[in-house]
């Protein structure tokens, strides 16, 4: 055969589906390696073929699309199954073809087993919920398409394995979820079933997304430095170690990029002739709010060293603030001899 | 070391420093389109505790850095021709700008 | 993202001229930074935290800016600062670059 466009197995687009739901995937040709759409090509009179490679096997074999009840089939630049089965699991391909162009991808397809409180080992996207911030929504993903507009489908909700109905601050609303106001105790995993008729059959979409309360944009501050502090004097005496932690407190805040960072003198570290090592460690609180250490150590510190001044910086996208420790060189205590003076006075 | 790739594939760049604390820096790699727009890929703290990625690389590329040996590494898979570019390996420290820049490695791919 | 946009996208200048060009962020961003290269060669930075000069850049160049609006200037232009400039943010991830402003001797 000729030459052909080979973009390989694209594991971007892994795909996960449930056992015996409905499942549309479009051919990623379209979506993220051609230039033109499937309606530009088919005007062009270029066909999609699909074919596929079952879990541990290698040999590549065609789509059977005869089977009972049109299981599976091809709309345009879709591949339909309706329903999946378990041993649809393998890699996929798309091709594009005409006598004169070729190019093809393929992708994994995972067909997912779910238990009855919707367990799998399924990717769950997440959803972050600002706390306490008013009414937010969640939306059932990924349905589009599965359904016409004129079908109207039932959706029921779910929290972990309870079906959600009177509970104090979630609402379901069709194919949303509102949250009146959203705590901690929301966090978990959120599942959305769908129940619609096709041709005499009825068919369950579901969909499962993690829900993350998080520190709201309302709360946020710029951040707060808890150490260096003027409370704490680090008193060394040459040659002693020197050891000053940076702890920063950065309010969560989406996408915002936090950093701490020292100066000796104003200038980096490396820019001194000076043996310094800084440790980093990152902590985060429940709601994502970020606690980060730099600890600066001098082993052998010189009396040069502890007349330096020593400056803490944090950066977030709310602002930049900065603290100096407070250095000093250890007084030698005095040392007491003591004098015995034995004075004869004669008179 | 860059290279040629074939869509689908895989490649390992890497990257050594020195005459600076590798430590003290955030680490990260921008490439580079033939049609000269940069791109930022990824970045690793200073320990390689925790990573950031571009949404176009994130679940095909890996930053990593083994601080012993002053290496930065950027493992890409399922390489797109959309990936095409010269990867620079870029330090910053702080929050400031990338005040350093390696020379650059090319990478194609290509069918 | 913070989508970058800079302004003109190539602009020429001769010796001695002001120039001035531009990096208007969708969102607003703590800092701008800039940086300067030339064919051939690696990025070098220019001007850092949107108004300070990195070692070695000529006093001709200065950087302002707050929001989502920022400017490089050359007071005087000369023959050797023909280059392409980048601004970036590092306010948010995804980091994010602007598409350049070509620089040419007329």
């Known amino acids: 055969s000729e030459r052909c466009d080979d973009w390989g197995l694209d594991t971007m687009r892994q795909i996960q589906v449930f056992e015996d739901e409905p499942a549309r995937i479009k051919c990623p040709l379209f979506e993220h390696f051609l230039k033109f759409n499937y309606s530009t090509a088919h005007s062009a009179g270029l066909t999609l073929i699909w074919y596929w490679t079952r879990q541990d096997r290698d040999l590549e074999e065609p789509i059977n699309f005869r089977l009972p009840e049109n299981r599976i089939s091809k709309e345009k630049d879709v591949l339909w199954f309706r329903p999946t089965l378990l041993n649809d699991t393998g890699n996929y391909t798309c091709m594009l073809r005409n006598t004169t162009y070729c190019s093809k991808v393929a992708f994994p397809l995972e067909v997912v087993q779910k238990d009855s409180c919707f367990n799998s080992p399924m990717k769950l996207p997440v959803h972050k919920l600002y706390i306490e911030y008013g009414i937010q929504r969640i939306t059932c993903p990924n349905v589009d398409g599965y359904f016409p507009s004129s079908v109207k489908p039932t959706i029921t909700w779910y929290m972990g394995c309870y079906k959600i109905q009177n509970f104090n601050n979630v609402i379901p609303e069709g194919m949303n979820l509102s949250f009146l106001i959203a705590l901690i105790s929301n966090n978990g995993n959120y599942t959305c079933v769908v129940t619609y008729p096709e041709n005499g059959r009825t068919f369950h979409l579901t969909r499962t997304l993690t829900v993350k309360v998080v520190g709201s944009p309302k709360n946020a501050v710029p951040p707060v430095i808890h150490s260096p502090n003027d409370h704490v004097v680090y008193e060394k005496e040459p040659g002693e170690e020197l050891l000053i932690p940076c702890t920063v407190y950065f309010s969560f805040l989406m996408d915002s990029r936090n950093e701490v960072w020292w100066t000796i003198d104003g200038k980096k570290p490396d820019d001194i002739t000076i043996d310094v090592t800084i440790n980093e460690s990152i902590s985060h609180s429940r709601t994502e709010d970020e606690t980060r250490t730099q600890i600066l150590s001098i082993k052998k510190v010189t009396s040069e060293d502890l007349k330096r001044s020593y400056v803490c910086h944090a950066r977030s996208a709310k602002g930049e603030v900065a603290k100096a420790a407070k250095v000093k060189q250890k007084v030698p205590a005095p040392r007491y001899t003591v004098e015995l003076a034995c004075g004869f006075g004669a008179t | 070391g860059g290279g040629l790739a074939k869509p689908g594939g895989s490649l390992k760049l890497s990257c050594t420093a020195s005459g600076f604390t590798f430590t003290s820096y955030v680490m990260s790699w921008v490439r580079q389109s033939p049609e000269k727009r940069l791109e930022w890929v990824a970045e690793?703290?200073?320990?390689?505790?925790?990573?950031y990625y571009s949404d176009t690389v994130t679940g095909r590329f890996t930053i990593s850095r083994d601080n012993a040996n002053n290496a930065l590494y950027l493992e890409m898979s399922s390489v797109r021709s959309a990936d095409t570019a010269m990867y620079f390996c870029t330090r910053a420290y702080g929050n400031s700008e990338m005040d350093f820049w390696g020379q650059g490695t090319s990478v194609t791919v290509s069918s | 993202q913070i989508v970058l946009t800079q302004s003109p996208a190539i602009m020429s200048a001769s010796p001695g001229e002001k120039v001035t060009m531009t990096c208007s962020a969708s969102?607003?961003?703590?800092?701008i930074h800039w940086y300067r290269q030339k064919p051939g060669t690696s990025p070098k930075r220019w001007i850092y935290?949107?108004?300070n000069l990195a070692s070695g850049v000529p006093a001709r160049f200065s950087g302002s800016g707050s929001g989502t609006s920022y400017s490089l200037t050359i007071i005087n232009m000369e023959a050797e600062d023909a280059a392409t400039y980048y601004c970036?943010?590092?306010?948010?991830?995804?980091?994010?670059f602007g598409g350049g402003t070509r620089l040419e001797l007329k």
């Open positions: 969102s607003s961003i703590s800092y």
């Open positions: 935290d949107t108004s």
């Open positions: 970036h943010q590092r306010t948010y991830y995804p980091l994010t």
């Open positions: 690793i703290s200073r320990g390689g505790s925790h990573t």
